[in-house]
């Protein structure tokens, strides 16, 4: 297994101690040697992987990660039981969903079972490297001639998330963003019939359960409109890979969603 | 008269690491996102690196994600690309240019070559 | 990630000709598809945005059409300027944007 090695932003209060024996400074040990930061990332809260740059060491080193909970019920001393490779070299360890707390201090340990005086302690807040996952199920409903309302889902809790919404057209060389709060909708309410748009979301652990940096993937986009819109702005021409549910399958509101997303909403 | 000016080139050993700098004139370079596109001389062009209007949105190529970093400071009118574990196959021309989804104006471009 | 595919990769013609390049997605794009012109030792050039919207200062004579995969490029009366490579590109689905190949075209 390849680990991607990412670079938090979001942990800037975490503390970081290493504790290195101290050598005379003519002999040069490899006890010396700063051991690699450990990085952690919570994927929706479902696992967590936490991992080093293997790379990094001056010959291939199966590094060892210990971790625990500081000041908890959980402060045994945990060993990893299930580490990620990169080239045959332990780079990562993955923890699972019932070893997250996320609102104690995580305390990780990475250590050279060669050297065991080298090794160095992290202590993270988890809350505050959460990831969530893509948005999904995104839905289009025309509110009025010229307005659009945006809708989507997470697979977490809602008021957990913050969002952030860009929006283009064809026409765009760039994107518009608006940030959106928890309530995961967002309306444009002024939409150019002559034009076609693209809407895509994603969502960040923030602020209210915690102070997580990092967004999530985006979601698939969402399209709307098409040359027809020419002959008549409000009748849209939806292209291949979008399908309008009829009235009666969404209760009296017509909603345009993705082909990805009906086949979804039809088969679970 | 828009104006895009790519210094930061150079020659590298493969692993090693380049900053890219692209500075511009002629425009409001707060109203634009920015990307860079690279081409190997003779070649097609392939994109990079894109990122939004504040700097808040960056998106990548998979062969570059992880190993290189696009960013801006707006008010000195520049684009950067950090480029970290550069492969051979990195070695190209980079260009920047103006926009995310397409590109309206480009810089001559500046030339890194990754090589043992 | 979308394809996109242009032919023919290279074409002769005389100055005062009507020229014609395709462009092909892998999948339906909308109208999200834009031309570059490149001349030898210089950087690309938007030409045409949105399939048919001609960029600010760009002559008349060339002209972008199409919708869903298929688009062409026309330039309606070759000048001597015009002989250089075009690249389309897609602006559908991003990440990532994805260039055509190019298609030179040269003196005949």
């Known amino acids: 297994l390849n680990t991607t090695i990412l670079t938090p932003n979001g942990n800037e209060d975490a503390t970081t101690d290493f504790f290195l024996t101290s050598m005379p400074t003519d002999s040069l040990s490899v006890s010396t040697l700063p051991l690699p930061e450990v990085q952690c990332f919570v994927f929706n809260v479902e696992y967590m992987n936490c991992t080093w740059n293997s790379s990094s060491e001056p010959q291939p080193t199966n590094l060892t990660l210990h971790y625990w909970y500081k000041n908890s019920d959980n402060d045994k001393v945990q060993k990893c039981s299930h580490y990620l490779f990169s080239e045959e070299i332990t780079s990562g360890c993955q923890l699972q969903k019932k070893e997250i707390h996320l609102y104690q201090t995580f305390v990780v340990q990475l250590q050279d079972p060669r050297e065991p005086r080298r090794q160095a302690t992290q202590m993270l807040k988890l809350q505050n490297l959460v990831i969530p996952w893509a948005p999904e199920n995104l839905t289009l409903r025309k509110l009025s001639e010229s307005q659009l309302e945006l809708n989507w889902n997470n697979r977490f809790l809602n008021h957990c998330l913050e969002h952030l919404v860009q929006y283009r057209t064809d026409w765009d060389h760039s994107w518009t963003e608006q940030s959106v709060d928890y309530r995961h909708k967002f309306s444009l309410p002024s939409v150019d019939g002559q034009k076609r748009y693209t809407f895509r979301v994603r969502s960040r652990f923030n602020p209210l359960c915690g102070s997580a940096q990092h967004w999530s993937e985006w979601s698939h986009p969402i399209h709307w409109g098409s040359n027809s819109s020419k002959e008549n702005p409000f009748l849209f021409a939806l292209e291949a890979e979008q399908k309008l549910i009829s009235e009666e399958d969404l209760g009296g509101e017509q909603k345009l969603i993705s082909e990805e997303d009906l086949h979804h909403h039809h088969h679970h | 008269e828009v104006q895009l000016v790519e210094s930061g080139g150079g020659v590298v050993r493969p692993g090693g690491s380049l900053r890219l700098s692209c500075a511009t004139s002629?425009?409001?370079?707060?109203?634009?996102?920015m990307s860079w596109v690279r081409q190997v001389p003779g070649k097609g062009l392939e994109w990079v690196s894109s990122?939004?209007?504040?700097?808040?949105?960056?998106d990548y190529a998979d062969s570059v994600k992880g190993r290189f970093t696009i960013s801006r400071d707006n008010a000195k009118r520049s684009l950067f690309l950090q480029m970290n574990s550069l492969r051979a196959e990195d070695t190209a021309l980079y260009h920047c240019?103006?926009?995310?989804?397409?590109?309206?104006?480009w810089g001559q471009g500046t030339l890194v070559t990754v090589s043992s | 990630d979308i394809q996109m595919t242009q032919s023919p990769s290279s074409l002769s013609a005389s100055v005062g000709d009507r020229v014609t390049i395709t462009c092909r997605a892998s999948?339906?794009?909308?109208?999200?598809l834009n031309w570059y012109q490149q001349k030898p030792g210089k950087a690309p050039k938007l030409l045409i945005y949105?399939?048919?919207s001609l960029q600010s200062g760009v002559p008349s004579r060339f002209s972008g059409s199409g919708s869903g995969t298929d688009f062409t490029l026309t330039i309606s009366s070759l000048q001597p300027e015009d002989f250089a490579t075009y690249y389309c590109?897609?602006?559908?689905?991003?990440?990532?944007?994805?260039f055509g190949q190019g298609t030179r075209l040269e003196i005949k």
């Open positions: 240019a103006t926009g995310e989804l397409f590109f309206d104006y």
């Open positions: 002629g425009f409001t370079f707060d109203d634009y996102g």
């Open positions: 990122v939004n209007r504040n700097g808040g949105t960056t």
């Open positions: 999948q339906s794009i909308s109208s999200y």
């Open positions: 949105a399939a048919s």
């Open positions: 590109q897609q602006s559908y689905s991003t990440p990532p944007i994805t």
